[in-house]
């Protein structure tokens, strides 16, 4: 039977080395055996290149194309072939379809003043345009309570987030994951990073104190209160 594309290719670029296109065929297809995606930069002297697609699902194909460090002017001509039959033809501008790389190495460290310090790595080298353009979303969720989750938007430069332990349930196990996007490129969100898990062992301040400590604290409080009035 004839080969047909049900959903035409949708492509995204990580804006550094790879563009990925995905499409759906109208019936289960052995993508690597039956199809080829040719791509060529619209640029003087550029050669035609061929990508061999892989199956993501029975009828969904995906092709990863190595590209040079992308620049805004780059436009690729894409042609999807089944043998000698041209199934689809289109163009793709990586700078207009950015999906950032996934942030890496998410770690959680205890920090001063009952806070957790979440750190991750910017997935781009400093010389890449996207390095300074990324903002992040951090999702923190209670492993045993689906209702207990928080989302933090990190819009400043550093790939870190300080989290007050008091905002989380004491003794509960929490997981965090992070994703990135590039606002100036109107990008989509990156994939989520792998989760990292930790135990929130924070206890409210008064629970850490013995009776004597509480008594001393009350004495200090009384003394300060009395001293304050004495000056009036």
């Amino acid at each position: 039977g004839s080969v047909k594309v049900l959903h035409e290719p949708s492509c995204f670029s990580d804006y550094i080395s790879t563009s990925v296109c995905q499409w759906k065929m109208d019936h289960p297809t052995n993508c690597s055996a039956e199809l080829r995606l040719s791509y060529q930069l619209d640029f003087m002297g550029s050669e035609n290149h061929t990508c061999v697609p892989e199956n993501r699902e029975d009828s969904v194909c995906v092709c990863s194309m190595p590209i040079d460090d992308a620049v805004e002017a780059d436009v690729y001509q894409l042609d999807l072939w089944a043998g000698q039959q041209l199934l689809w033809s289109g163009s793709f501008q990586p700078s207009k379809h950015v999906k950032p790389r996934t942030p890496g190495n998410l770690t959680v460290h205890p920090n001063i003043s009952h806070t957790w310090l979440l750190m991750w790595t910017n997935p781009y080298p400093t010389e890449n345009h996207l390095h300074s353009e990324l903002t992040y979303m951090v999702n923190v969720s209670n492993d045993n309570d689906p209702e207990d989750f928080k989302v933090y938007n990190v819009t400043y430069m550093g790939p870190t987030l300080r989290l007050a332990a008091s905002t989380l349930k004491s003794g509960a196990s929490y997981s965090a994951r992070v994703r990135a996007w590039a606002q100036t490129y109107n990008s989509t969100w990156s994939d989520w990073s792998p989760s990292t898990t930790w135990l929130n062992y924070y206890e409210p301040w008064e629970q850490h104190l013995g009776l004597n400590d509480i008594f001393e604290a009350q004495k200090i409080e009384w003394h300060e209160h009395h001293h304050h009035h004495h000056h009036h």
Epitope: L41, F43, M44, G45, S46, E47, N48, H49, P66, I67, D68, V71, E72, A73, D74
Partner: antibody
Amino acid sequence: EVQLVESGGDLVKPGGSLRLSCVASGFTFRDYAMTWVRQAPGKGLQWVSTISGSGGKTYYADAVKGRFTISRDNAKNTLYLQMNSLRAEDTAVYYCAVDRLTKTIRPQYYGLSVWGQGTLVTVSS
Amino acid sequence: DIVMTQTPLSLSVSPGETASISCRASQSLLYSIGYNYLDWYLQKPGQSPQGLIYLGSKRASGVPDRFSGSGSGTDFTLRISRVEANDTGVYYCMQALRDPYTFGQGTKLEIK
């Protein structure tokens, strides 16, 4: 040492044909686009044609489109320019030159970095 | 097509002085930051052209640092400092952003 040697230039009558050759040495020929540029007597430089490293992409000046064909034999490290339906205004010295590196996705450009010595084509009755 | 206009068409300079040649393109030659597809070539009398500057400001291999290229977009300049007798010839700018490649008319440099 990178070197280009052109040959094939001659005196030919209008409407005639000629094939120019350019033999390359000293670099990986197949990795680079190659270009022909010509210079009419006492005039400036004029681009004629360019071919990508694999030979898969060709480009022509409007003045020669449909009459000239650029090709290459990467096994022989040789660039060709087949010139048909020649006219008096095609009279010029023809130079071949090394153009951009085309084995990368976006070709890397270093200018027309090396030029041949040129071969003279004269079209006259 | 992109039209390249060179000025002046001829130039006479004393040895040791600085020569400047301008080249204007009818369209921007900037493809991406730092990548202006504009070259400068020198053709000495009776010789083949030789590359001096590519991508607007990068010196070709073996070219002395007396030769420098500057500019971006549509306006470019070739400067030759401490001019020598050996610098005589015709200087051409050329755009290589897209086909057809186009050359300026050429500037004839004469050493006094």
